[in-house]
């Protein structure tokens, strides 16, 4: 997250970190069910661990943390690397979470976002770009949903209805390491960090997010079919 600020503790209990060995964060994710996460499809890896209820990026033990293995990864069938359409994936955890103030799911919004909606994006991704500098703790950033026209103008021929753009002033954006993390609007999960320009936070080049309102049926059916 570029030019965000430290999230208040306990305010993002659905935020997950996807980790490679040894404790290497590569993506964010979102708890949407006691045993299921949503993340970006481009975050798919064979072997990874899931950390929930953790505030700092470092692997130091925190009392609220819960660690899991991903036992099943189900990318949306319409996703094709390295494209960006349909960029979402469900991850089944090896066990159900223990609900606490630090770990609990968020509902996915069935309403599509309208331009001007205020949202919050979070993650442990780099806070500089193109340099790489990681934060000590989870970062939060207020962003506004942009109209689909502004989105298409920013990225001609690259935007479809499985995506929406959101941003703020130039110099504020999600970035590398934030993929799969939540965009929360009006208390529900509206999007996932997906892609954007490089370097991040360039003027008139907003972040692009997976438009989850288009996938509520697939999410529900996939969880039911695999539970």
């Amino acid at each position: 997250i570029i030019n965000g600020s430290d999230c208040d503790m306990h305010t993002q209990p659905w935020q997950a970190a996807l980790l490679l060995r040894p404790n290497q964060l590569y993506c964010g994710a979102v708890l949407v069910h006691p045993q299921w996460l949503l993340t970006a499809a481009h975050c798919r890896k064979k072997v990874f661990r899931v950390r929930l209820g953790h505030y700092s990026l470092s692997p130091v033990y925190e009392s609220g943390q819960q660690m899991f293995q991903g036992v099943k990864s189900i990318p949306h069938p319409g996703y094709s690397h390295p494209g960006h359409s349909n960029d979402l994936m469900l991850i089944k955890l090896n066990r159900r979470i223990r609900p606490t103030k630090d770990v609990r799911p968020i509902n996915v919004s069935s309403h599509c976002p309208s331009a001007g909606t205020k949202c919050l994006v979070s993650g442990w991704g780099t806070t500089k770009s193109p340099q790489v500098h990681f934060p000590k703790v989870l970062q939060c950033l207020n962003i506004s949903v942009l109209s689909q026209k502004r989105c298409e103008d920013a990225y001609p021929r690259q935007i479809d209805d499985t995506m929406f753009c959101a941003g703020d002033k130039a110099g504020r954006d999600s970035c590398q390491g934030d993929s799969g993390g939540p965009v929360v609007c009006n208390g529900s999960l509206q999007g996932l960090v997906s892609w954007g320009d490089y370097p991040c936070a360039r003027p008139n080049r907003p972040g692009v997010y997976t438009n989850l309102c288009k996938f509520t049926k697939w999410i529900q059916e996939t969880i039911q079919a695999n539970s």
Partner: antibody
Framework: EVQLVESGGGLVQPGGSLRLSCAAS????????MNWVRQAPGKGLEWVSY????????DYADSVKGRFTISRDNAKNSLYLQMNSLRAEDTAVYYC???????????????????WGQGTTVTVSS | DIQMTQSPSSVSASVGDRVTITCRAS??????LAWYQQKPGKAPKLLIY???SLQSGVPSRFSGSGSGTDFTLTISSLQPEDFATYYC?????????FGGGTKVEIK
């Protein structure tokens, strides 16, 4: 078949210019960042330049900064390297290489260069 | 710039031998290291990415390990087609830099 084919190399005098081209086929060129890498005779690999998929980010090795210009034409599936003020030490085989890392995607995961051309030889000599 | 130091610069080995090549970065690069194989007159070929992930189509006798500053490429049982020069490369930070190479020769 995924393929990169370089062209444009040759013999040039010190201070001269050359333009290298790299034609891509078998994949969606505008989804990938690209690189130029060179190898002087009997020496190791040296990264020369990088360009992101949308051309929004470009970088160069210090040894070529201000003299070389990387560009791409996604409509033509082509990558270019304009080389000016050439020096004897620029003599090398020049490879174009596809970068497997999508810098547009916002995961923190880096791969490397998975597809390389056969190389084109540049000789700078009087 | 990040310096990549490979050792040894050359190694003589026989078919069936286990060969280990090391690469050291001048500063931490997490797991973001790639290994390439290059045969004379040919372009390099990506073997391993993210320090330990095998590129599609690469034989399982090749393996990589390490993170931070110290990395290793191992060929568990050297085959005739493995005699080549091997390069490491750090990929997260511009300018990208390669190690000086390790030539694996027939003993």
């Amino acid at each position: 078949e995924v393929q990169l084919v370089e062209s444009g190399g040759g013999l040039v005098q010190p201070g001269g210019s050359l333009r290298l081209s790299c034609a891509a086929s078998g994949f969606t060129f505008n989804d990938y960042s690209m690189n130029w890498v060179r190898q002087a005779p009997g020496k190791g690999l040296e990264w020369v330049s990088y360009i992101s998929s949308s051309s929004s980010y470009i970088d160069y090795a210090d040894s070529v900064k201000g003299r070389f210009t990387i560009s791409r034409d996604n409509a033509k599936n082509s990558l270019y390297l304009q080389m000016n003020s050439l020096r004897a030490e620029d003599t090398a085989v020049y490879y174009c290489a596809r970068d497997l890392t999508s810098m547009q995607s916002r995961d923190y995961y880096y791969y490397g260069m998975d597809v390389w051309g056969q190389g084109t030889t540049v000789t700078v000599s009087s | 710039d990040i310096q990549m130091t490979q050792s040894p610069s050359s190694v003589s080995a026989s078919v069936g031998d286990r060969v280990t090549i090391t690469c050291r970065a001048s500063q931490g690069i997490s797991s973001w290291l790639a290994w390439y194989q290059q045969k004379p007159g040919k372009a390099p070929k990506l073997l391993i990415y993210a320090a330990s992930s095998l590129q599609s189509g690469v034989p399982s006798r090749f393996s990589g390990s390490g993170s931070g500053t110290d990395f290793t490429l191992t060929i568990s049982s050297l085959q005739p087609e493995d005699f080549a020069t091997y390069y490491c490369q750090q990929v997260p930070i511009f300018p990208y830099t390669f190690g000086g190479g390790t030539k694996v020769e027939i003993k």
